[in-house]
């Protein structure tokens, strides 16, 4: 008589995660009597996938009725496939006995599961950095299969090259993850800049998946300080201006000191934005010259985004003829940040 054949016609089957997979198996003869079982993997560690007689296999159903007389089709359908279902499945014929004896195995069908990568998540540095410093951004995407994937970084549409990317695990796995780090050198103009992590995979029918991060979350642009004195008023009051320009973020506190004593403290709020995303702020202080016998040392002290305070100081010279003092004089930048206004 002709030897029994267990036929698994497909060498491999690919399926998308979430779909059903059909694994085909037919036998060439009804003899000898005995059950068919499905296993994943071969050898002693193989995993029982389906056995008509016993066990509970909620995701596995026979394609045709196995109880039907003269049934020779033992194909199965596995529903709601996940990457964890990937592997080689064997249809195995047993001879009835106590216990049943393995008689013949099919050649096996390799089930490969295609799974889409998760939306890339981009995270930036924990603390802000200033222009000319390098910051790192990280992009992660998970759960994809097969392993082949491309990841690109862009800053304002231009591809970044200082990038390190790893796909894990290195060996064969049911699904994979990608992690990439891009190093970006900040400039003062980067408040409105954006970095994009772009992930492309065989399963994606659209354009690559994108994750974004705004450099505004990573950058600190320290302010420029300039102090100027307006014209002496008729009532012997000097109007002194502290101009704080081109800073980001908005979190800023300005304190006026007269001869070392706090005169006034202000917090920046609801400032209009410059084109480049930075902010400007101007504070005024009126100094009554006639109330002072000696020179007045004025200090504009700015604390920006929790950083150490920056000071600009100058002296108002109290003269016998205060009305003759100069007007619209900008304090000069000196090594000690001291300004003398005459």
């Amino acid at each position: 008589e002709e030897e029994l054949q267990v036929i698994q016609p497909e060498k491999s089957v690919s399926v998308a995660a979430g779909d059903s997979a059909t694994l085909n198996c037919t036998v060439s003869s009804l003899i000898p009597v005995g059950p068919i079982q499905w296993f994943r993997g071969a050898g002693p560690g193989r995993e029982l996938i389906y056995n008509l007689k016993e066990g509970h296999f909620p995701r596995v159903t026979p394609v045709s009725d196995p109880t039907k007389r003269n049934n020779m089709d033992f194909s199965i359908r596995i529903s709601n496939i996940t990457p964890a279902d990937a592997g080689t499945y064997y249809c195995v014929k047993f001879r009835k006995g106590s216990p049943d004896v393995e008689l013949k195995s099919g050649a096996g069908t390799e089930l490969s599961v295609r799974a889409k990568p998760s939306a890339p998540v981009v995270s930036g540095p924990a603390v802000r950095a200033t222009a000319e410093h390098t910051v790192s951004f990280t992009c992660e995407s998970h759960g994809f299969s097969p392993r082949d994937i491309t990841l690109k970084w862009f800053k304002n549409g231009n591809e970044l090259s200082d990038v390190q990317t790893n796909v894990d695990p290195a060996g064969k796995s049911v699904s994979y993850s990608i992690r990439s780090t891009a190093r970006v050198v900040l400039t003062r103009r980067d408040v409105h800049s954006q970095v994009i992590c772009e992930v492309a995979h065989v399963t994606l029918q659209g354009d690559p998946l994108r994750g974004t991060a705004n450099l505004s979350e990573a950058i600190r642009v320290p302010p420029f300080l300039e102090v100027t004195q307006q014209s002496m008023r008729a009532d012997n009051q000097v109007n002194v201006t502290c101009q704080v320009t081109k800073f980001y973020p908005q979190r800023l506190q300005l304190t006026w000191l007269e001869n070392g004593n706090v005169s006034r403290t202000e917090m920046a709020s609801a400032l209009p934005e410059n084109k480049d995303g930075t902010y400007n702020w101007t504070s005024w202080l009126l100094v009554n010259v006639s109330a002072h016998r000696d020179d007045v040392k004025l200090t504009c002290q700015v604390e920006h985004d929790g950083q150490p305070a920056v000071n600009k100081s100058f002296s108002v010279k109290v003269s016998a003829h205060p009305k003759e003092q100069g007007s619209n004089t900008a304090a000069e930048n000196t090594g000690t940040n001291e300004r003398n206004i005459y």
Epitope: K11, S12, S14, V15, A16, E110, S112, R114, P146, D148, I149, T150, A200, H201, V202, T203, L204, Q205, G206, D207
Partner: antibody, heavy 116, light 109 residues
Framework: QSVEESGGRLGTPGTPLTLTCTVS????????MGWFRQAPGKGLEYIGI?????SPYYASWVNGRFTISKTSTTMDLKMNSPTTEDTATYFC?????????????WGPGTLVTVSL | DIVMTQTPSSVEAAVGGTVTIKCQAG??????LAWYQQKPGQRPKLLIY???TLESGVPSRFKGSGSGTDYTLTISDLESADAATYYC???????????FGGGTEVVVK
């Protein structure tokens, strides 16, 4: 599920020509679609694809000779300045449901003849 | 672009026989290889994708194998209906571009 090309005709060199691919049974917003051509007696040649979101990508040799676009139900291939070398049967095709690495639904093709 | 070299350009075999067609990629394509059958005046028909996965409805006489740069299509138990031209097609996951082999004409005696 099917796709069908139309618009093939006899054209003259330099005169733009537009081919249309009409799909039925599935949505163009869910699949990548491709254009291919086959010169008489020659093999298949890839021209370009358009993603589900409408972004076109072209073979490196195209160099602006073709433009791929789409509406909700059709995909177009515009031959910007055809030459006699563009005489071929043009096919549109849809990628498989599992990925963009293969094409499982092809149209019957439409013949374009460019001659003086 | 990746160049796909398909051999032979033509092959003849008898009904019931076996035909082997080879396709070599200019660089690794990580099993992203499909095989198509095209008969004169007809559209291409997908047979196999991902190097070895049989498209639904395609007889198991068609077998695909290979990895890296070298791939093979084997047609066994040849039938007269198998007379056609066969093309391999690659997809490169980095450039995201496609390329076809030159085709193999199969003549069934």
């Amino acid at each position: 599920q099917s796709v069908e090309e139309s618009g093939g005709r006899l054209g003259t060199p330099g005169t733009p020509l537009t081919l249309t691919c009409t799909v039925s049974g599935f949505s163009l917003s869910s699949y990548v679609m491709g254009w291919f051509r086959q010169a008489p007696g020659k093999g298949l040649e890839y021209i370009g694809i358009i993603s589900s979101s409408g972004s076109p990508y072209y073979a490196s040799w195209v160099n602006g000779r073709f433009t791929i676009s789409k509406t909700s139900t059709t995909m177009d291939l515009k031959m910007n300045s055809p030459t006699t070398e563009d005489t071929a049967t043009y096919f549109c095709a849809r990628v498989g449901p599992l990925g963009v690495d293969y094409f499982n639904i092809w149209g019957p093709g439409t013949l374009v003849t460019v001659s003086l | 672009d990746i160049v796909m070299t398909q051999t032979p350009s033509s092959v003849e075999a008898a009904v019931g026989g076996t035909v082997t067609i080879k396709c070599q990629a200019g660089q690794s394509i990580n099993s992203y290889l499909a095989w198509y059958q095209q008969k004169p005046g007809q559209r291409p028909k997908l047979l196999i994708y991902y190097a070895s996965t049989l498209e639904s409805g395609v007889p198991s006489r068609f077998k695909g194998s290979g990895s890296g740069t070298d791939y093979t299509l084997t047609i066994s138990d040849l039938e007269s209906a198998d007379a056609a031209t066969y093309y391999c097609q690659s997809w490169h996951y980095i450039s995201r571009s496609y390329a076809f082999g030159g085709g193999t004409e199969v003549v069934v005696k």
